[in-house]
């Protein structure tokens, strides 16, 4: 008799794929024309990335460091009107993209939380949550919570409001902290909070260190749902050497939890790579005309247009990974097991019941390596086969779909492999 199927876990929408942050509307749209009406026209692009949520803003009125001139209920007219926002929500909903609003109060100022008036600001946030939930947003983000006195209790209160409206709404908190204890203490009082931090960027970027960071994090947070990013707001290129970008994309999409990216991560956009750009919000490179001030500053392979036409580009890899992440049970909610492999490597398996299983092998090193996969430390339910099919490699030159012998597996420098193999009873 066939074995019984394992019961599927409850899946919230943010469990099903990546979140995409647009912290600066103008920089994202380029040509100084960034507003909500224009963003509506970019939703097809977001759909093509198969992201599940858009983390937007802040958009509210905020006069730098002035509490009295900060109104979390009002959209800054430079971004558009409330009705523009409503129309964006409707269009996004039709494309199955959820919209999360960043309500970090003093986003134009020095201290994002007006440190001297925390209580009055916290009350403003409470009112804003109620207001924007009524308006149809799917969740909220607040950043720099390490600068918020008594952050845990405020977050608990805000989460209660958000979840009280609907269990389907999400609260994201961001911190610059990379300290695991601090992160765990913030998570403890909030059962469904998604926390973005600098935890993974506090790394020597070796396979062993990354493996230890990931396993420590998962052990410390127990069976709660995680999010994975390198920071609460920045671009991957600000934290990673260029040669590891593809590897990290593969890792973020295949770890158990929600991957969170910033606009431009999918094309390897660099902070301040072009003259005169602000470090925190570089202009999105849609095509070669995205930076008209300096002719020739942008080459085609740096742009969305150029990379869309190149199957070997970072953008094409992002789309492939996002597609796999959103449709494969083992990647959606599968169990996660790391196992021993060669030095410099980080390898793990994702599996769910009788569904196709996925093997991820990441070479963080500068030299080619034998995988040296040792399945002895895997549980019986997750044993390795002798061969697995290649879903994708982060490097060109391998034929997708080809079977690879795991015992003889070799990886190029900085290569990551995503392999699949069937469940065998």
């Amino acid at each position: 008799r066939a074995p019984r199927c394992r019961e599927l876990p409850a899946q919230k929408w943010w469990h099903t794929g990546a979140l995409y942050r647009i912290g600066d509307l103008q920089a994202f749209q380029g040509h100084g024309s960034g507003n909500l009406a224009g963003l509506k026209g970019r939703l097809d692009y977001l759909s093509s990335l198969k992201v599940k949520g858009l983390v937007l803003g802040p958009l509210h009125k905020n006069q730098k460091d002035d509490v009295a001139q900060t109104d979390l209920l009002q959209i800054d007219p430079n971004f558009g009107s409330k009705e523009d926002f409503d129309n964006l929500l409707q269009s996004a909903k039709k494309k199955s993209i959820r919209v999360i609003l960043d309500l970090t109060p003093n986003y134009r100022g020095e201290n994002l939380w007006f440190s001297t008036q925390v209580d009055s600001v916290a009350t403003k946030v409470k009112d804003a949550l109620e207001f924007w939930l009524q308006a149809g947003v799917d969740g909220f983000q607040v950043r720099d919570i390490e600068n918020l006195k008594d952050a845990s209790s405020f977050l608990a209160e805000w989460e209660n409001i958000t979840k009280g409206f609907s269990e389907d709404r999400l609260l994201i908190a961001g911190t610059n902290s990379s300290d695991l204890q601090q992160i765990v203490s913030l998570l403890e009082s909030n059962k469904d909070l998604l926390l973005t931090s600098s935890y993974l960027s506090d790394s020597s970027f070796t396979g062993e260190h990354t493996k230890s960071l990931v396993t420590q994090y998962l052990n410390a947070t127990g069976n709660r749902w995680c999010s994975w990013s390198l920071s609460q707001a920045g671009l991957l290129t600000s934290f990673l050497p260029a040669q590891l970008l593809r590897l990290y994309q593969l890792m973020l999409f295949t770890l158990p939890g929600t991957p969170v990216f910033s606009y431009g991560d999918e094309i390897g956009l660099k902070a301040a790579a072009l003259p005169g750009q602000p470090v925190e919000a570089p202009v999105m490179l849609w095509d070669e005309s995205s930076f008209p001030d300096i002719p020739g500053a942008v080459s085609a392979n740096m742009t969305v247009k150029g990379q869309s036409e190149d199957p070997g580009s970072l953008l094409s890899l992002f789309r492939q990974l996002s597609d796999q992440r959103s449709k494969e049970r083992s990647l959606l909610h599968g169990d996660f097991h790391t196992f021993s492999s060669g030095p410099g490597l980080f390898s793990y398996i994702r599996h769910w019941d009788q569904n196709e299983r996925f093997l991820v092998v990441l070479n963080f090193g500068d030299v080619g390596l034998s995988a040296g996969l040792q399945a002895s430390d895997l549980p019986a339910s997750a044993s390795l086969p002798t061969k697995a099919d290649l879903v994708l490699s982060t490097q060109p030159g391998r034929e997708e779909g080809s079977p690879l012998e795991l015992e003889r597996l070799k990886l190029e420098p900085h290569e990551g492999l995503l392999l699949r193999f069937p469940y065998v009873a």
Partner: antibody
Framework: QVQLQQSGAELAKPGASLKMSCKAS????????IHWVKQRPGQDLEWIGY????????DSNQKFKDKATLTADKSSNTAYMQLSSLTSEDSAVYYC?????????????WGQGTLVTVSA | DIQMTQTTSSLSASLGDRVTISCRAS??????LNWYQQKPDGTVKLLIY???RLHSGVPSRFSGSGSGADYSLTISNLQQEDIATYFC?????????FGGGTKLEIE
């Protein structure tokens, strides 16, 4: 509270133009578009178009593209609709309306209507 | 353009009755369906938005339901002040369009 106050009834000759107004109060004028809706006697409602007072951007029903011109004056919180080349088909009540504070497109606030009669 | 059809143009009912008015769209409108009440003096009020959500200040005897292309408005305990014409409107796609209206009268 939110109010939309429309200008009074108009009698106009065929071929002429006229401009009606809709003065908004009780909210920040630039936050919401002003929509215009037509209703001929004993008939259903027809959406004409909207103006975004914040940017002056307009979008309208193809059917009214050459008939209605929408403008707004932020300083007086007033939206205007000008109808040109009037014919008896333009005799109707014209309403201005505004969305509510929720994302589904629906008109939560309506003016009292301006009756336009086109007659020689 | 999306066509909105209210098949019943007028309806007679007694006070206290439960009355249902239907509306059909020419295509799926993803629940972006609103109901309005127009009194004989021309005053227009929003009753229901997004298929089933009651606008603030509207009595709970009004309710809405439906999905895809078919929607309905129900008045559960008809009152004298409910005598009016009821219009449906789709907010799914520009241009927004309205149904022809259903005039409700007391028997």
């Amino acid at each position: 509270q939110v109010q939309l106050q429309q200008s009074g009834a108009e009698l106009a000759k065929p071929g002429a133009s006229l401009k009606m107004s809709c003065k908004a109060s009780g909210y920040t004028f630039t936050d919401y578009y002003i929509h215009w809706v037509k209703q001929r006697p004993g008939q259903d409602l027809e959406w004409i178009g909207y103006i975004n007072p914040n940017s002056a951007y307009t979008d309208s029903n193809q059917k009214f593209k050459d008939k209605a011109t929408l403008t707004a004056d932020k300083s007086s919180n007033t939206a205007y609709m000008q109808l040109s080349s009037l014919t008896s088909e333009d005799s109707a009540v014209y309403y201005c309306a505004r969305k509510g504070h929720f994302y589904a497109p629906s008109f939560a606030y309506w003016g009292q209507g301006t009756l336009v009669t086109v007659s020689a | 353009d999306i066509q909105m059809t209210q098949t019943t143009s007028s309806l007679s009912a007694s006070l206290g009755d439960r009355v249902t008015i239907s509306c059909r769209a020419s295509q799926d409108i993803s629940n972006y369906l609103n109901w309005y009440q127009q009194k004989p003096d021309g005053t227009v009020k929003l009753l229901i938005y997004y298929t089933s959500r009651l606008h603030s200040g509207v009595p709970s005897r009004f309710s809405g339901s439906g999905s895809g292309a078919d929607y309905s408005l129900t008045i559960s305990n008809l009152q004298q002040e409910d005598i009016a014409t009821y219009f449906c409107q789709q907010g799914d796609t520009l241009p927004y369009t309205f149904g022809g209206g259903t005039k409700l009268e007391i028997e």
